[in-house]
């Protein structure tokens, strides 16, 4: 804590600025005045304070605004973001996207901390929802935030979301996450037409049921092996061969190579033999 | 460098329960995923059982009712309690980490055999 001492005469900052690097703790905590610093917050990050000066600083905006910061300071603060703790965030509302894409870039290339943890829970709970933006911006700076959502948080994900996300943000998401995700990308993407929908939705059909499955193979799509050995077990098993022929089009022949593995492996066993004879391919039930 | 280590694996009796450990270190502090897969001889990896950032957990259909997934936050560990074991329960039993960033790590892995 800084003790409370006068400015020394002709000291006083008229703006926030370079000289002030060479301020000591106290004499920026007499000096600088808490409102100057909070209209001019985007200087500070041009200027090379020590740690210990931003911990002046951000005691006089903690002094400032007891009750949180303001949008227009949050969104300013740079690398004084890292100062914060969580409950200092816990006290703010955050509702520009804007704001959220700068404080995430100050983290950026790192682990995602408690303070960055604690900014999108509050941001995400000031809008609702997790919108179609929101997720956008999540999952091009943390990869992995989509699939370390759990199932009861996912089901609030909206499916015009479901739109923002990639093949490889899914990549991490188990069994149970995919349940969730799949039928709201099969509403998500309901307009599309069969090669359209099927280049979009194959990414999560690890959570599509029998039905789903069954009326793709109706539709020509040539599932690969990779996506085939993703799907549900409970799903693959009632697929007739004819089905799971259709299904995976020219890549039937790869069954083969994986019949020793599930679901392939427990999808043979239910079916009748000469059916499975008819895909030439020697594989026993 | 994140490093994950399984115990508590061994031999044991259909109908009986054994208790899995998952201890992480290397992670300072991420938004955190831990699951549970296991891999018996001649199949793939399958799911077990996840725990998530918001403590809330999820299962496998088939060890729902029969296995628990918990966490103990002060000693960086995840724990797999199998009950009621069937033999089909026989398998390497491995740990997974993730972090919302994208960082992922396995464990080696611990035997699970159950005889009957």
């Known amino acids: 804590e800084v003790e409370k001492t006068a400015c020394p005469s002709g000291k006083k900052a008229r703006e926030i600025d370079e000289s002030l690097i060479f301020y000591k703790k106290w004499e920026l905590e007499a000096c600088v005045d808490a409102a100057l610093l909070a209209t001019q917050m985007d200087r500070v990050n041009a200027i090379p304070f020590t740690y210990e000066q931003l911990d002046v600083l951000k005691h006089k905006l903690d002094e400032l605004y007891p009750q949180g910061y303001p949008e227009s300071v949050i969104q300013h603060l740079g690398y004084l973001f890292l100062k914060m703790s969580p409950e200092d965030i816990r006290k703010w509302n955050v509702t520009s996207l804007e704001t959220l894409k700068a404080l995430l870039e100050v983290n950026k290339g790192h682990e995602m901390s408690p303070q960055v943890a604690t900014l999108i829970d509050r941001f995400v709970k000031g809008r609702g929802q997790l919108d179609k933006d929101t997720l956008d911006t999540l999952t091009a700076f943390y990869p992995g935030y989509l699939c370390s959502l759990s199932p009861e948080e996912l089901s609030s994900v909206p499916p015009s979301s479901i739109w923002a996300v990639r093949p490889q943000d899914l990549d991490t998401c188990d069994p149970r996450q995919l349940d969730v995700l799949y039928p709201k990308a099969r509403l998500a993407f309901q307009n599309m037409n069969g090669s359209e929908y099927f280049v979009k939705i194959q990414s999560f059909l690890g959570g599509a049921p029998t039905e789903d499955l069954k009326a793709l193979s109706q539709q020509n799509v040539s599932m690969d092996l990779a996506t085939f050995m993703k799907l549900r077990t409970d799903a693959v098993l009632p697929l007739t061969v004819a089905e799971v022929q259709k299904l995976l089009g020219p890549h039937v022949e790869g069954l083969k190579a994986e019949e020793r593995h599930r679901p392939v492996r427990d999808w043979i066993l239910r079916q009748r033999q000469d059916d499975l004879d008819t895909l030439g391919l020697g594989l026993q039930g | 460098q994140v490093h994950l280590m399984e115990s508590g694996g061994g031999s044991v009796q259909a109908g009986g329960s054994l208790r899995l450990s998952c201890a992480r270190s290397g992670v300072t502090y991420c938004r955190l995923t831990m699951r549970w897969y296991r891999q018996a001889p001649g199949s793939e990896r399958e799911f077990v059982s996840a725990i998530y950032s918001d403590g809330s957990t999820a299962y496998a259909d088939s060890v729902k009712g029969r296995f628990t997934m918990s966490q103990d936050d002060a000693k960086n560990t995840v724990y797999l309690q199998m009950n009621s074991v069937k033999p089909e329960d026989t398998a390497m039993y491995y740990c997974?980490?993730?972090?919302?960033?994208?960082?992922?790590?396995w464990g080696q892995g611990t035997q699970v055999t159950v005889s009957s």
């Open positions: 997974k980490l993730n972090c919302a960033s994208g960082l992922t790590a």
